[in-house]
Interface confidence: low
């Protein structure tokens, strides 16, 4: 089998891959480079929240239905250190981070920065978990679309060293003057993979639960002092959450985090795993997920050992759904799929055969239909119920992967592509 199935980033460190990036990135910004606006009826606002200031606290980006639509768009990747982290994740020289920054440092995502929350309604809540090498801002297309349909979305930035980069403040004084301490991605030796990835997914689940607790406390009116100096009054969120309607969604490593979180925290009523990477999960988890769970997979990332683990979550008394998006790649769920033109996107496996807008639209609509069904929403998302069953020309019901050959090495398959 392929070495990449054991070592998540090994195949990206090959000189061929590095050369590909270095030669082609200069052209990356040509072609269609827009992160799509949400398709729903609500304007979308965005802010960041960190509490407490330490690396054990919660750090998240919040997308929410907004009162107005006249604010500046949100900076997509807000600090140079994130680009340095991405270059480390890609196995390239740190100078590559500066090139990435030149290309993408001023790119925005279509949400109104620090815009006031739209009042007068209680919104369902989604906690979102990013993948390996990503961070809180890289799934804005999903967060914005959900918020445009009336969800509050809390995109967590994990501090388990699986993010390309993240920051915190060493103490209160550091927080007051904005003196950030940065944590970069931890690269693992082959023999560390199983143990450390399981530790990380457990920490990630705790961070999702902690993010939920924090938001519910704010909803109850606890005065939260954001460690970040931002002009968004968290008190606006008081009485804004529909506390019975809470879900968790994540991509790749975040997909595994969804499953771990559901098994630990019954406050989450359902979960959606986007192209989940199942390797980090311990065997004890599969039978401990009573909530409805929806797997939305790409066509080209999945492999038998991973699908077998997904199937271990199934049992007759539990609600499980799975669809596969035809012609899609692992990165079709993350914003980088919109950051480059077609040719570059194909070469870097950021884009698949399917149009990126079509792929994310299918995923988002299927997600909304699933959320309506299992959170008991009174919306019109049931118009997309057929997508949950894979009933669309661009969808495959279930999976395209044949799992009948049982010689696959389940234990050692970690199988990852680029940003998980």
């Amino acid at each position: 089998f392929d070495w990449q199935y054991i070592n998540p980033v090994a195949h990206m460190k090959s000189s061929a891959w590095v050369n590909k990036i270095q030669v082609l990135m200069a052209a990356a910004s040509f072609g269609q480079t827009k992160i799509p606006r949400g398709n729903g009826p609500y304007s979308v606002g965005c802010t960041d929240l960190m509490f407490d200031h330490t690396n054990k606290g919660t750090f998240l980006r919040l997308y929410y239905p907004s009162q107005d639509n006249d604010r500046l768009d949100t900076l997509w990747i807000p600090n140079k250190e994130y680009f340095w982290g991405l270059s480390k994740f890609l196995g390239t020289h740190w100078l590559m981070g500066n090139i990435l920054r030149l290309l993408f440092g001023s790119m925005t995502t279509p949400a109104n920065w620090n815009s006031p929350l739209r009042p007068g309604e209680k919104y369902p809540l989604v906690v979102f978990s990013h993948g390996l090498g990503a961070f809180r801002t890289l799934y804005s297309a999903i967060g914005i679309d959900l918020a445009s349909h009336g969800f509050i979305v809390a995109a967590v930035e994990h501090r388990d060293r699986s993010a390309s980069a993240t920051y915190y403040f060493k103490d209160q004084s550091a927080a007051e003057i904005g003196d950030k301490s940065w944590l970069y991605l931890r690269t693992l030796k082959q023999e560390e993979e199983t143990h450390i990835r399981n530790e990380q997914v457990r920490q990630r689940a705790k961070e999702c639960s902690q993010a939920l607790s924090l938001i519910l406390d704010i909803d109850h009116g606890k005065p939260v002092k954001n460690a970040l100096d931002l002009k968004f009054d968290m008190e606006q969120l008081k009485d804004s959450i529909d506390r019975e309607k809470i879900a968790v969604i994540g991509h790749s490593f975040g997909g595994a985090t969804v499953i771990q979180t559901l098994s630990e925290d019954q406050r989450f009523r359902c979960g959606i795993a986007l192209d989940a990477w199942m390797f980090p999960l311990g065997d004890e988890v599969y039978s401990r997920i009573p909530q409805p769970l929806f797997f939305i997979n790409s066509e080209y990332f999945q492999y038998p050992a991973n699908i077998i683990k997904m199937k271990k979550c199934y049992s007759p008394d539990k609600e499980r759904k799975m669809i596969t998006i035809r012609g899609s790649v692992h990165q079709n769920f993350a914003d980088f799929t919109f950051a480059t033109g077609k040719i570059i996107g194909h070469m870097l496996k950021l884009k698949g055969d399917i149009d990126s807008n079509v792929a994310i639209d299918l995923s988002n609509k299927a997600s909304l239909a699933f959320l309506q069904k299992h959170l008991g929403l009174h919306k019109d998302f049931d118009q997309w119920d057929c997508l949950i069953e894979g009933d669309d020309e661009n969808l495959i019901p279930g999976t395209n992967i044949n799992t009948t050959n049982q010689h696959i090495m389940l234990q050692n398959s970690s199988g990852i592509e680029k940003y998980n």
Partner: antibody, heavy 116, light 112 residues
Framework: EVQLEQSGPGLVQPSQSLSITCTVS????????VLWVRQSPGKGLEWLGI???????DYNAAFISRLSITKDNSKSQVFFEMNSLQANDTAIYYC??????????WGQGTSVTVSS | DIVLTQSPLTLSVTIGQPASISCKSS???????????LNWLLQRPGQSPKRLIY???KLDSGVPDRFTGCGSGKDFTLKISRVEAEDLGVYYC?????????FGGGTKLEIK
């Protein structure tokens, strides 16, 4: 209902250590912070230290060398330990739940006398 | 550290009359997010302190509306519109804008 229950000795010998346990109910230590305050006889309130929800602790600079605050989230317990007590450490020691710079709830207090 | 100076030290009031306590800070308590983290506590005789007001003017649940808090920057005031017997005790202002948290020296409210 939120409650903080303190347990610890009333009498401590000079130069010995003081250990107080604050057991909380009605909230989670993974979300709330817990701080410690003391009140010397006839005096006001003095902030001693805090353990943040994330697990790190910060201390009043005057006590940093002899104070330790730790916790066990699973048991909902916070542990306060102060070394090398002297007569002027005689006070009522309080734990309080602390949430974003607002003192919400207080323990009943532990009256500590330092005397031989 | 921030020094909070309360005045008066003792306040002797007749039941039904108003009362006012001042708290002055050595530095502005306005945080960068536009809020001042200034709270008022009441410690009744023989009891633990109890928070009455947070964020300068917001009343804790169960606190009678005869209590009001106001002020900004460095100067803050707690007012009681009509003092009742249960209001006696020591009132403390406490700031959380700057680390470490600090308390005022306390104002003892006595009933005449």
């Amino acid at each position: 209902e939120v409650q903080l229950e303190q347990s610890g000795p009333g009498l401590v010998q000079p130069s010995q250590s003081l250990s107080i346990t604050c057991t909380v109910s009605g909230f989670s230590l993974t979300t709330y912070d817990v701080l410690w305050v003391r009140q010397s006889p006839g005096k006001g309130l003095e902030w001693l230290g805090i353990i943040w929800s994330g697990g790190s602790a910060d201390y009043n600079a005057a006590f940093i060398s002899r104070l330790s605050i730790t916790k066990d989230n699973s048991k909902s317990q916070v542990f306060f330990e102060m070394n090398s007590l002297q007569a002027n450490d005689t006070a009522i020691y309080y734990c309080a739940s602390y949430y974003i710079n607002a003192l919400d709830y207080w323990g009943q207090g532990t009256s500590v006398t330092v005397s031989s | 550290d921030i020094v909070l100076t309360q005045s008066p030290l003792t306040l002797s009031v007749t039941i039904g009359q108003p009362a006012s306590i001042s708290c002055k800070s050595s530095q502005s308590l306005l945080y960068s997010n536009g809020k001042s983290f200034l709270n008022w506590l009441l410690q009744r005789p023989g009891q633990s302190p109890k928070r009455l007001i947070y964020l300068v003017s917001k009343l804790d649940s169960g606190v009678p509306d005869r209590f009001t808090g106001c002020g900004s920057g460095k100067d803050f005031t707690l007012k009681i519109s009509r003092v009742e017997a249960e209001d006696l005790g020591v009132y403390y202002c406490v700031q959380g804008t700057h680390f470490p948290q600090t308390f005022g020296g306390g104002t003892k409210l006595e009933i005449k």
